[in-house]
């Protein structure tokens, strides 16, 4: 009786289990009674990432400078070419088939996680006690200065756009 | 048993953008080549893109590179295709399809499709 | 890229008739050759992989045969339910390409 499914690295065609190629391998021609799977490695060029039965390699991944990519990791005949961004850009996606400018947090939010090629930048609010003043894709939020060391008092309160304005005490006579 | 279930289709303006999505059920997703075929109205069947299990490696056919982008999120079993500067030609029924053991075509198991309208 | 060229574009036949379908490559595509069936408002369905393999749940009655450059998909006595439209689609080269399909209607 024919099999109706394959151990695993294997697979049915014409009634019978074959052999998957190996990784870095594409299939040039199925098994039989007689002869066992035909595969034949990749070229120079190319890839295979798993246990298969492609009848072609996958070229590797060309990253486009004019995209703002560069290789991070070379491709081998099991893997694919992985592109990154070039420095202030991130990718746009988990394949990284391009890159954008990372995004600068605004005044009243600090940055929480600074930007990789792979990542955005990550921005939160300013709490409390805590501002800032310029568009930044590097600044945190700065905690308002503290009137009281200096032996100042606060004449103006801050907000998570601006600092404390701090000012001499008032002299009682 | 396998499912795969699409969301996302509508009528878009030429150079809007929209994204499908395929939720996949019944078979290890990330072992999987999963793709993207569309059908104009009327019309046969055409090859859009195609992702690796990994999620690393990407193809597109050349109407639409630079401009479509297929992903996947293995731990949610979801495939996406994020589509941007969209044209009338891209108006299709558009179909994700998981290759069979081993292989990125044919394909096994198709979802139910969703429809694209581009037109102003 | 492979170009598949179907005929004839629409087969008009009866139930319980022989319908033949044939797939012309522009070149070699080996053995890796696909059958799907489709029907108005449907999904594609597998029927054949590699020239002559039936998917899982297809009945006997279709069949593949060819290599190369001239495949044919053969069913062998025409259902009601098989009226539909046929699509053949290579995958010995890249990007995998689908025929124009034929259409097989009732007469």
């Known amino acids: 009786e024919p099999p109706t499914a394959c151990r695993e690295k294997q697979y049915l065609i014409n009634s019978q289990c074959c052999s998957l190629c190996q990784p870095g391998q594409k299939l040039v021609s199925d098994c039989t009674e007689f002869t066992e799977t035909e595969c034949l490695p990749c070229s120079e060029s190319e890839f295979l990432d798993t246990w298969n039965r492609e009848t072609r390699c996958h070229q590797h991944k060309y990253c486009d400078p004019n995209l703002g990519l560069q290789v991070q990791q070379k491709g081998t005949s099991e893997t694919d070419t992985i592109c990154t961004c070039e420095e202030g850009l991130h990718c746009t996606s988990e394949s990284c088939e391009s890159c954008v400018p990372h995004r600068s947090c605004l005044p009243g939010f600090g940055v929480k996680q600074i930007a990789t090629g792979v990542s955005d930048t990550i921005c939160e609010p300013c709490p409390v006690g805590f501002f800032s003043n310029v568009s930044s894709a590097f600044e945190k939020c700065r905690p308002w200065t503290s009137c009281e060391t200096k032996d100042l008092v606060v004449q103006q309160a801050g907000t998570n756009k601006t600092d404390v304005v701090c000012g001499p005490q008032d002299r009682q006579r | 048993q396998v499912q795969l279930v699409q969301s996302g289709g509508g009528l878009v303006q030429p150079g809007g953008s929209l994204r499908l999505s395929c939720a996949a059920s019944?078979?290890?997703?990330?072992?999987?080549?999963m793709s993207w075929v569309r059908q104009a109205p009327g019309k046969g069947l055409e090859w859009v893109s195609t992702?690796?299990?990994?999620?690393?490696?990407?193809y597109y056919t050349d109407s639409v590179k630079g401009r479509f982008t297929t992903s996947r999120d293995n731990p949610k079993n979801t495939l996406f295709l994020q589509m941007s500067s969209l044209r009338a030609e891209d108006t299709a029924v558009y179909y994700c399809?998981?290759?069979?053991?081993?292989?990125?075509?044919?394909?096994?198991?198709w979802g139910q499709g969703t429809l694209v309208t581009v037109s102003s | 890229e492979i170009v598949l060229t179907q005929s004839p574009a629409t087969l008009s036949l009866s139930p319980g008739e022989r319908a033949t379908l044939s797939c012309r490559a522009s070149?070699?595509?080996?053995?890796?050759l696909a059958w799907y069936q489709q029907k108005p408002g449907q999904a594609p369905r597998l029927l054949i992989y590699?020239?002559?393999n039936r998917a899982t749940g297809i009945p006997a009655r279709f069949s593949g045969s060819g290599s190369g450059t001239d495949f044919t998909l053969t069913i062998s006595s025409l259902e009601p339910e098989d009226f539909a439209v046929y699509y053949c689609?290579?995958?010995?080269?890249?990007?995998?390409?689908f025929g124009q399909g034929t259409k097989v209607e009732i007469k």
């Open positions: 399809a998981k290759g069979i053991v081993g292989a990125t075509t044919p394909f096994d198991y």
């Open positions: 019944g078979f290890t997703f990330s072992n999987y080549v």
């Open positions: 992702i690796r299990g990994s999620g690393i490696s990407t």
């Open positions: 070149q070699s595509v080996r053995s890796f």
């Open positions: 590699e020239t002559s």
């Open positions: 689609q290579q995958r010995s080269d890249w990007p995998p390409t």
